[in-house]
């Protein structure tokens, strides 16, 4: 009997009620491999999900998130609301980054501006809600014979504002 079932191709299932003959998957179901005893229910892309690829008898539907949301998880299993750059998502909606913090993405959370002075640098370009500060050379860097060693990673004040 097992041998009969193994002959059933993708898109069908081995129907025990009909002497192991291969029956097509019913509507809104699929089997992506041969020898299946049942077909799986097709994924439905509804609510914040939209259909990227329709379900067929041999493959599941694929979903994306609707406009204003982004995918999380394997095969876009979750959708999370977008915000604008310069904002972060809270339970009460999108909130502007607090002063001294920024977010250059439509998702995620605000993080503090780099503290240039911790590296002995000066602020060359001020930070905004959407962009980090740009640190410029310290006066010592501009003096003759100053080293041009690679600067360390940007420093942040510990415990400073979000994240």
């Amino acid at each position: 009997l097992q041998d009969l079932c193994s002959n059933c191709p993708a898109g069908t299932f081995c129907d025990n009620n009909r002497s192991q003959i291969c029956s097509p998957c019913p509507p809104n179901s699929f089997s992506s491999a041969g020898g299946q005893r049942t077909c799986d229910i097709c994924r439905q892309c509804k609510g914040v999900f939209k259909t990227r690829k329709e379900c067929s008898s041999t493959s599941n539907a694929e979903c994306d998130c609707i406009s204003g949301y982004h995918c999380l998880g394997a095969e876009c299993s979750m959708c999370e609301q977008d915000c604008k750059q310069g904002q972060e998502l809270t339970k009460k909606g999108c909130k502007d980054c607090c002063f001294g913090t920024f977010n250059d993405q439509k998702r995620g959370i605000c993080r503090p501006w780099t503290n240039c002075s911790l590296d002995g640098k000066s602020v060359l370009v001020n930070g905004t809600k959407e962009r980090d500060v740009v640190c410029g050379p310290s006066p010592a860097d501009l003096s003759p014979g100053a080293s041009s060693a690679t600067p360390p990673a940007p420093a942040r004040e510990p415990g400073h504002s979000p994240q």
């Epitope: 999380l72 998880g73 394997a74 299993s77 979750m78 999370e80 809270t90 339970k91 993405q105 995620g108 959370i109 993080r111 503090p112 780099t114 980090d132 990673a153 940007p154 942040r156 979000p162 994240q163």
Partner: antibody, heavy 116, light 108 residues
Framework: QVQLVQSGAEVKKPGESLKISCKGS????????ISWVRQMPGKGLEWMGK????????NYSPSFQGQVTISADKSISTAYLQWSSLKASDTAMYYC?????????WGQGTLVTVSS | DIELTQPPSVSVAPGQTARISCSGD??????AHWYQQKPGQAPVVVIY???NRPSGIPERFSGSNSGNTATLTISGTQAEDEADYYC???????????FGGGTKLTVL
């Protein structure tokens, strides 16, 4: 597809240093937070801290501040968790996970055993 | 930092409803997320942002969150639901994530 692959199990003695890794693939590693989560034997999940690999900004749980260091090298899409002096109480499974609130992808875990 | 308290264990007969609570000061002001962890495996999201269910998670899983308590409800519990469940929240006060202590769900 998105994957987080962690370095292998480690057996260390108290006082030794250790650095474990978490390599991301299949997504823009620089622009997603990576968190580290500890699970001691038979115990629950504990969030240790997170890093934004794009600029290596870190944020720690008060319980782990000063105990561990989280770092990242975005050029090789890898985050790290390190100890300068291990204790027996550091024996645990350590997971890296993508995200800061919703952890949608997890590494397979790195088992760290510290014993004299 | 907020502390999240869960019952260490919950038992339920197959087909019955299991409810797992997660208590914390004003947790309803933050999003709560729920993870399922089976032995030897990494955790998996079963509910995110209080009540949203990822695709691939059975419809019997649902969540709610208000006041000081978030709740994970499993209707028509099945043997395969036996696992440890953890609530978590991200707090904008300390900019940290906190997990509850975990609840072992036993299906009798």
């Amino acid at each position: 597809q998105v994957q987080l692959v962690q370095s292998g199990a480690e057996v260390k003695k108290p006082g030794e240093s250790l650095k474990i890794s978490c390599k991301g693939s299949g997504y823009s590693f620089s622009t997603y937070w990576i968190s580290w989560v500890r699970q001691m034997p038979g115990k629950g999940l504990e969030w240790m801290g997170k890093i934004y690999p794009g600029d290596s900004y870190t944020n720690y749980s008060p319980s782990f501040q000063g105990q561990v260091t989280i770092s990242a090298d975005k050029s090789i899409s890898t985050a790290y968790l390190q100890w300068s002096s291990l204790k027996a109480s550091d024996t645990a499974m350590y997971y890296c996970a993508r995200g800061y609130g919703i952890f949608d992808y997890w590494g397979q875990g790195t088992l760290v055993t510290v014993s004299s | 930092d907020i502390e999240l308290t869960q019952p260490p264990s919950v038992s339920v007969a197959p087909g019955q409803t299991a409810r797992i609570s997660c208590s914390g000061d004003n947790i309803g002001d933050q999003y709560a997320h729920w993870y399922q962890q089976k032995p030897g495996q990494a955790p998996v999201v079963v509910i995110y942002q209080d009540k949203n269910r990822p695709s691939g998670i059975p419809e019997r899983f649902s969540g709610s969150n208000s006041g000081n308590t978030a709740t994970l409800t499993i209707s028509g519990t099945q043997a395969e639901d036996e696992a440890d469940y953890y609530c978590s929240t991200y707090t904008f006060v300390g900019f940290t994530t906190v997990f509850g202590g975990g609840t072992k769900l036993t299906v009798l």
